[in-house]
């Protein structure tokens, strides 16, 4: 139960009052306001929007609203020297060039400063060579090419379709395979849902539409020039050669009209199986190079983008807590967009704006939350989560001592089918209880709870009658809070039906066609899904900031730890000979998980029984809950990834968007049969089991009685 005790307020100021104040019409109005011009990170337009949000949050009633600026490495196309790709003949003449921009959507023809499609942080270069089609450029795709098909990508330009994994992983894989350039394209198989028209007549990607995006492999570092520290006025910056995560080969994105022209001429090997074929009318031959008649033609990339240190601005709003002002619950989402940001990020920013307005309304009526709530409008998320990471680096000592929870608020929708939640296990019960109290916006579920429609449409694979909640990966601003600092984190949005729509993300992601009209006409005309997401995100923040006992259930961590231990053991047992030879034991890990389970159970019993009127004991129990997530942090970080420090979860080494459990053990086991020194490789597996077992045991002990 939420509580209002000690905050000197009337009973009407509870969760219901906060939720009732949230209005779909306001979210709609805010979305329109935020999407009329581009708000690219580092531009004057985005600075002006930061100041507007600062001003409005002050008007809404927050105690203080400040801009926090940093000077970080960003990347832009050269305005006078555009990026493009050519097919050249044997004389070097360009016989085909890809488009220089996306045809603007209706009503936006005269908008200036639309950045053309580019891969942010691509180095400059004009490589030319034969093309190799590498499917999604996943680790397993390169294994198929190199090991099974014996195709060498060294010195080749590779063309990969977007989807399945983060684009930065694709580029890293191509680099490791020896490619000298990467072309990324959107295949209709992944970005054109059957039976839906392309924009502006529907929500599908037109042939001239292109996905922008950064291609960094930062592994949580933030600004590439100041890893670990804020990019402030007195920062020491690395030289560009020492910068973290920059790609070493030119990369450029194109749409499927242009991709058709490149892929239709491909020769060489046939695709290995149907999973390598998209939906274009091309053979999807792997190459290398073009077929017979065109075998003398090559592909040439022309990339002239520049990396520039540029000022960015976060907006940080504070609503001081009445009882525990030194405990922070953070709601943050980014403000910068690639172009108009109709979905990403402004569908999220508009929801944050309405949540701030609702909290402000309650505050003006005399209410305060028990704990401090911080609201953040992050900059430069699209360039590598830079704004959130720099702010967290600057404030890390405060955050690690005072951070209760972080709720992320990027895009509110990626579909309109059902809820999608990724969070720490500590928040499972909070999410379950909250969604049981909220009304479902779904057709056919009138009068039913959100929990009911969500569970029906997205059931848990393990527990019947419960909804699916996923692991946190990365690719968004919770990363530094969860993966580096160990602050309990969660995110929620409305999503598509993954069963029937197997395309990646939403079709117009990071294109010029991500407009206000896309949302208003096709995704959420009544803004009812936005309102539901506002209720979920806002409701989580309200409970985290206002409940007397933190709404964390440590027993749910015990359950998942057992599941993850079972899974990693099973992976390891696929190598029984080596397990026996090198005496690889999971006994310590299973024993630690058993201890955690028992101690968590006892802690939960004490949590029911203790005297909540004793502020010292209350604070002590709450601190044990708050610091549990922190206990899973290894100060040394994961191998070669020092800013990924959570031992239970990390972004997958093969897909930044996905979460991996026991990532240290998982990575040590990955492709272990190909390692040149098996003894050393299995030694590392044993070391990672030791680290995991120790961490789980240490975390368990933080829940034991203190004396």
């Amino acid at each position: 139960k939420s509580s209002n005790e000690a905050t000197n307020i009337t009973p009407k100021h509870n969760m219901k009052a906060f939720l009732d104040e949230l209005k779909a019409e306001n979210i709609k109005k805010f979305l329109y306001n935020f999407t009329q011009i581009p708000h690219l990170a580092g531009t004057e337009q985005n600075f002006q929007l930061a100041k507007q949000i600062q001003s409005q949050w002050k008007e809404f009633g927050l105690d203080s609203v400040e801009l926090a600026h940093y000077d970080v490495l960003l990347s832009y196309p050269n305005k006078t020297h555009p990026n493009y790709i050519s097919i050249i003949n044997e004389d070097g003449n360009e016989i085909f060039n890809t488009s220089l921009f996306e045809p603007p959507p209706p009503g936006y023809e005269n908008v200036s400063d639309i950045v053309p499609p580019f891969s942010a942080f691509s180095p400059q270069g004009m490589p030319e060579g034969d093309l190799v089609y590498v499917n999604y450029a996943r680790t397993e795709d390169f294994f198929k090419l190199e090991r099974d098909m014996k195709i060498n990508c060294s010195g080749k330009i590779v063309i990969a379709r977007y989807g399945k994994v983060f684009r930065g992983n694709k580029v890293k894989n191509a680099q490791l395979a020896g490619a000298k350039g990467v072309i990324l394209y959107s295949d209709p198989a992944d970005y054109f849902a059957p039976g839906v028209k392309s924009y502006p007549d529907g929500w599908n990607l037109p042939g001239g539409g292109v996905q922008r995006g950064n291609i960094l492999n930062l592994n949580g570092a933030g600004d590439p020039l100041t890893p670990g520290y804020p990019a402030n006025e007195y920062a020491y910056r690395r030289g560009i050669a020492e910068a973290v995560g920059l790609p070493s080969i030119p990369v450029h994105p194109i749409g499927y009209y242009d991709a058709q022209k490149l892929l239709e001429k491909m020769g060489g090997s046939a695709p290995p199986d149907s999973s390598w074929r998209g939906s274009l009318k091309v053979p999807y031959n792997v190459g290398p190079g073009f077929t017979g008649n065109f075998s003398t033609q090559k592909v040439k990339m022309h990339i002239h983008s520049t990396n520039e240190v540029t000022r960015i601005y976060n907006v940080i709003g504070t609503l001081r807590g009445a009882v525990e002002p030194d405990r922070y619950v953070i709601l943050g989402g980014h403000r910068d967009s690639w172009v108009f940001g109709g979905i990403d990020p402004q569908s999220g920013a508009a929801v944050v704006h309405e949540i701030v307005r609702s909290f402000g309304t309650l505050k003006k009526e005399g209410w305060r939350p028990r704990r401090t709530i911080l609201f953040a409008s992050w900059d430069a998320e699209e360039f590598g989560l830079l704004g959130s990471t720099e702010w967290a680096e600057e404030n890390s000592r405060l955050l690690q001592e005072r951070g209760v929870a972080y709720i992320n608020a990027d895009s509110s929708i990626e579909g309109n089918y059902t809820l999608r939640v990724d969070c720490t296990p500590l928040m499972y019960s909070l999410v379950h209880n909250l969604t049981k109290e909220l009304k479902s916006p779904d057709e056919g579920f009138e009068g039913k709870s959100l929990y009911e429609s969500w569970t029906k449409k997205s059931p848990s694979p393990e527990f019947s009658g419960m909804p699916r909640i996923s692991k946190l990966g990365s690719g968004n601003d919770f990363e530094v809070f969860f993966q580096r600092l160990g602050i309990a984190s969660g995110r929620a949005r409305y999503t598509k039906n993954w069963e029937t729509n197997k395309f990646s993300g939403y079709p117009l992601y990071h294109s010029v066609y991500e407009t206000y009209e896309l949302v208003e006409k096709f995704y959420d005309p009544m803004f009812k899904y936005h309102l539901t997401v506002a209720q979920v995100r806002g409701g989580m923040v309200f409970e985290l900031a206002n409940s007397i006992v933190l709404p964390f259930d440590c027993r749910d961590y015990a359950v998942v730890l057992r599941k993850y231990a079972d899974k990693i053991y099973s992976i390891s047992m696929k190598h029984p000979q080596e397990m026996k030879t090198y005496s690889v034991s999971f006994d310590s890990l299973f024993s630690a998980v058993k201890n955690f389970t028992e101690i968590a159970s006892k802690f939960s019993e004490r949590l029911q029984d203790f005297d909540k009127s004793n502020p010292i004991v209350l604070r002590m129990m709450n601190d044990q809950l708050m610091f549990l997530e922190r206990a899973f942090i290894d100060p040394l970080g994961l191998p070669d990834r020092p800013f990924y420090r959570h031992v239970i979860y990390a972004p997958s080494s093969h897909n930044k968007y996905a979460g991996e459990s026991f990532p240290g053990i998982y990575d040590a086991l990955f492709d272990i049969e190909s390692k040149v020194d098996p003894s050393k490789a299995w030694g590392e597996v044993k070391r990672q089991i030791y680290v995991a077992a120790f961490t789980v045991q240490a975390a368990a002990e933080t829940l034991s009685e203190v004396a």
Partner: nanobody, 113 residues
Framework: EVQLLESGGGLVQPGGSLRLSCAAS????????LSWVRQAPGKGLEWVSS????????DYAATVKGRFTISRDNSKNTLYLQMNSLRVEDTAVYYC??????WGQGTLVTVSS
């Protein structure tokens, strides 16, 4: 002391079935994931299947998927392997494994006409 005792092996014709059991003692049975591993005559060890805390979390080698079913009864401290549609190439000594280092002595399964 950890003890794993397999039983249920024997001679069976191709297409036949067998159910292997592994009685466990000396440890908190329900707290551990368990596996079956086999070794065909003159060959190396081959993982067959693993099971987690309950009968929902199971994993199988491609060679046995759809034919073999792993299960456990935590109240009896026993692990099982139901083997159907047996083939000649399933002939092997089958071992029950806890945590990677504790192995049973094995039970021989011979599939022959």
């Amino acid at each position: 002391e950890v003890q794993l005792l397999e039983s249920g092996g024997g001679l069976v014709q191709p297409g036949g079935s067998l159910r292997l059991s592994c009685a466990a003692s000396g440890f908190s049975f329900s707290s551990y994931a368990l596996s079956w591993v086999r070794q065909a005559p003159g060959k190396g060890l081959e993982w067959v299947s693993s099971i987690g805390e309950n009968n929902h979390t199971t994993d199988y080698a491609a060679t046995v998927k759809g034919r073999f079913t792993i299960s456990r009864d935590n109240s009896k401290n026993t692990l099982y392997l139901q083997m159907n549609s047996l083939r000649v190439e399933d002939t092997a000594v089958y071992y029950c494994v806890k945590d990677g280092v504790h192995w049973g002595q094995g039970t021989l399964v011979t599939v022959s006409s």
